[in-house]
């Protein structure tokens, strides 16, 4: 069997000869050189060589434990004369012993850290870490102690943990923002002869809200024309805050003043300015100057700094309203007028009124926009705004006339306003009723008396308030000895009835009936319409078979049995 223990080797050997490691030995070795020792594995033949006859192992190079602390090799012992192994292959370990040849190295050459300004003493800032490549399990070669070389009295470091903490009260970012701290890490527990390394820690004080906003001036003045529509910006004010970021954000509000309802203030998030804007329409003639009290405040306040005072400031804003020459203003947004359709030319319909709202109260002249009254049916008195007709009207042609009236300042024709005028034409009974259609009907030769052969309907272009009421009758000249009668149904219709039994188409093939239609309005209007009645031969069902030589234009839906 094999005879050896674990091999140990000191790192960084500087001797001139090869460093002796140890001896491989088999109890089968009789010392006669018949055994051959073979080495394989980590560094065999290169870092480690073996005397194949004696089993002595040597290291050929300077070894660094930090590069490789353990080498695993395999040993074989073979009888040269038989070629047979005398031992099974076995693994053995060469362990490299540590010396203090590595200084502590920080994980970063430069650390960056932040801590809030005004922090309490002992507030954690950052932990720095240095590692020592030497063996931590043996001696103090890798026992690191931290100390501060630069950065006092502002900061301190815990010697064992590398934790950096604040060491001074009330460090104010607005006074100083950046600190450079140098930390040393020393091995051997910090004792003499230990190796050391340093790192730089750049510490930035982060902002807290310990400063209120401040207006650089107590009063601001702006001007704006009275014509400024709501939303118009009229000026910017800016309070400054020594803090940064969220802590320097400012909200503006109007807290007092006669302009409270007339103006708004909005905060420009990019510039942190307060923009004064118009809220309601201004009127120079009503009020020329407004004063506002505007407040600038921090939306995010840290309660622990409230003892420093309120985190807001206010300023007075004076706004001067400038006069603007305004166009005339009509008394109404639109006018609705009425006139009878039988009105004579130059009949006055009504009037419009417009005034210059300016203090000057400039006189106004009126005109009709001719694009809206191409036929010049209406006219206006340029001085007093009276509207009158210049042509005859007809309701049945056009019921509503929509025109535009213009009011213009005489001294400044550029200042003008327009208003719509809606003129309704009222109905007058100036149209007679007429047949709704051309009536041509027929009667059967064998018709009986009092048979209905046609129903009559009438139309009237007028539009009486109480609705149409038509009456129907035979014209006086046809009333006596007529072969037909007219029956007024009192519902704006009438019926033509036969007056005798039987008709002879050879005696009389066509009858012309003059019918008078009257309305019931004032003045009464009437007209006479003629109904053509043809005598036809019919079958026993009353269906027309043949009439006179001319073809009968037979109205659709006519009841032939009438």
């Amino acid at each position: 069997s094999w005879m050896w223990n674990q091999f140990f080797l000191l790192e960084e050997y500087t001797g001139s000869d090869y460093q002796y490691v140890g001896k491989l030995h088999s109890d089968q070795d009789r010392g006669d050189g018949s055994l051959k020792y073979i080495l394989s594995g980590d560094g065999a033949g290169d870092l480690f060589i073996i005397n194949e006859n004696t089993g002595d192992i040597q290291a050929t190079k300077r070894l660094d434990r930090e590069e490789k602390p353990v080498y695993i090799l395999r040993a074989q012992a073979i009888n040269r004369r038989t070629g047979r192994p005398v031992e099974p292959e076995s693994e053995f370990i060469i362990k490299i012993h540590d010396i203090n040849d590595n200084e502590p190295i920080f994980t970063k050459e430069v650390y960056t850290a932040t801590v809030p300004e005004m922090s309490d003493v002992g507030t954690f800032v950052v932990q720095v870490t240095a590692t020592d490549a030497d063996d931590p399990t043996y001696g103090n070669s890798a026992k690191v102690v931290y100390s501060i070389l630069q950065g006092q009295p502002y900061f301190s470091v815990e010697s064992e943990t590398g934790i950096i903490k604040t060491a001074l009260l009330n460090m104010d970012r607005e006074n100083r923002e950046q600190y450079q701290v140098v930390i040393q890490a020393k091995d051997m527990g910090g004792q003499m002869g230990g190796l050391s390394g340093t790192t730089t820690v750049n510490i930035t004080l982060t902002d807290v809200n310990d400063n209120p906003p401040r207006f650089p001036q107590s009063t601001y003045q702006f001007k704006t024309p009275e014509s400024s529509p709501p939303g118009t910006p009229i000026g910017r004010i800016k309070a400054s805050d020594a803090d940064v970021g969220e802590n320097a954000e400012i909200e503006y509000s109007i807290t007092d003043g006669e302009g409270l309802d007339m103006f708004d203030v909005i905060t420009d998030q990019e510039t942190q300015e307060g923009i004064i804007t118009v809220k309601k329409l201004l009127d120079f003639e009503k009020k020329k100057v407004y004063t506002l009290k505007v407040e600038a405040s921090n939306p995010y306040v840290e309660p622990r700094f409230l003892y420093l005072g309120p985190f807001k400031d206010s300023a007075t804003v004076r706004i001067v309203v400038e006069d603007v020459d305004e166009p005339p203003v009509f008394s109404k947004l639109a006018y609705i007028l009425q006139i009878r359709e039988d009105a004579q030319i130059n009949t006055t319909i009504g009037s419009v009124t417009a005034q210059d709202p300016d203090a000057a109260r400039n006189p106004v002249k009126y005109s009709v926009d001719r694009h809206t009254d191409m036929d010049r049916i209406f006219n206006i008195d340029s001085g007093n705004g009276s509207i009158f007709t210049s042509k005859l009207l007809d309701r049945e042609t056009l019921l509503w006339h929509n025109i535009t009236v213009i009011a213009t300042e005489i001294n400044n024709p550029k200042q003008s306003s327009r208003v719509p005028l809606y003129i309704k034409v009222l109905d007058v009974n100036d149209n007679a009723p007429e047949f709704a259609e051309f009536y041509e009907t027929f009667v059967c030769e064998k018709a009986k008396a009092d048979q209905l052969i046609q129903t009559l309907h009438a139309v009237d272009k007028d539009d009486p308030y109480s609705g149409h009421q038509f009456s129907f009758s035979l014209a006086p000249e046809a009333a006596s000895g007529s072969n037909f009668t007219i029956q007024d149904n009192k519902d704006n219709t009438a019926g033509i009835l036969t007056r005798k039994n039987g008709y002879n188409r050879h005696e009389m093939s066509t009858y012309l009936l003059p019918v008078v239609i009257s309305d019931n309005d004032y003045p009464v209007q009437s007209s006479t319409g003629t109904v053509t009645v043809r005598v036809c031969a019919c079958d026993h069902h009353g269906n027309m078979q043949s009439c006179h030589a001319e073809a009968l234009i037979h109205p659709t839906g006519l009841s032939t049995g009438a």
């Epitope: 051959k36 074989q76 073979i78 009888n79 040269r80 004369r81 038989t82 070629g83 047979r84 192994p85 031992e87 099974p88 292959e89």
Partner: antibody, heavy 119, light 106 residues
Framework: EVQLQQSGPELVKPGASVRISCKAS????????MNWVKQSHGKSLEWIGD????????TYNQKFKGKATLTVDKSSSTAYMELRSLTSEDSAVYSC????????????WGQGTLVTVSA | QIVLTQSPALMSASPGEKVTMTCSAS?????MYWYQQKPRSSPKPWIY???NLASGVPARFSGSGSGTSYSLTISSMEAEDAATYYC?????????FGSGTKLEIK
């Protein structure tokens, strides 16, 4: 060049004995053990035993004790194997082989001697 | 005695194909040795001490294993590799051989 030259084929009767020789050249005969191996026709190999030419110490496979006897003649660098009480089971090719480890491991084989046991 | 069982007894492979044959020992052995034998020739030492190639053996051959399980592998079969391969143990007397794996070329 290392060579192991064996004697020629043998035809022997059952019950008889035979002696096979193996002459070594190209290396120092006493430096390495001589092994003998049997290979029956179409069959595998069997290790018979070995001899240290230095001191004629032998090691046998238990199966071949009483069947094979190994000897050497240092002066002629020759190894011998005698087989006795032959039966048909002993018909095979017998080879000498020398193994060792110098710079690297090696194994030299003789060309083999065919022994046929037949009435 | 330690019995060495080789498998397969017979196998064939195409040129370029990877070939693996195994040798299983009835008891644990420290090392395995392999020999190549072609018809009408003596065996040639092929692999020693489990994984070392004997002088002149092509690098496509490799050996591995431990305890009772060992193998010989050819990474890319060539025609000249057709032969019978025997495993052998020198750990315990009698020093036994396997029954052989005959490798043929397709």
């Amino acid at each position: 060049e290392v060579q192991l030259q064996q004697s020629g084929p043998e035809l022997v009767k059952p019950g008889a004995s035979v002696r096979i020789s193996c002459k070594a050249s190209g290396y120092t005969f006493t430096d390495y053990y001589m092994n003998w191996v049997k290979q029956s026709h179409g069959k595998s190999l069997e290790w018979i035993g070995d001899i240290d030419p230095n001191n004629a110490n032998t090691t046998y496979n238990q199966k071949f004790k009483g069947k094979a006897t190994l000897t050497v003649d240092k002066s002629s660098s020759t190894a011998y194997m005698e087989l006795r009480s032959l039966t048909s089971e002993d018909s095979a090719v017998y080879s000498c082989a020398s193994f060792g480890y110098d710079v690297e491991w090696f194994g030299y084989w003789g060309q083999g001697t065919l022994v046929t046991v037949s009435a | 005695q330690i019995v060495l069982t080789q498998s397969p007894a017979l196998m064939s492979a195409s040129p370029g194909e990877k070939v693996t044959m195994t040798c299983s020992a009835s008891s644990s052995v420290s090392y395995m040795y392999w020999y190549q034998q072609k018809p009408r020739s003596s065996p040639k030492p092929w692999i020693y001490l489990t994984s070392n190639l004997a002088s002149g053996v092509p690098a496509r051959f490799s050996g591995s294993g431990s305890g009772t399980s060992y193998s010989l592998t050819i990474s890319s079969m060539e025609a000249e590799d057709a032969a019978t391969y025997y495993c052998q143990q020198w750990s315990s007397n009698p020093f036994t051989f396997g029954s052989g794996t005959k490798l043929e070329i397709k």
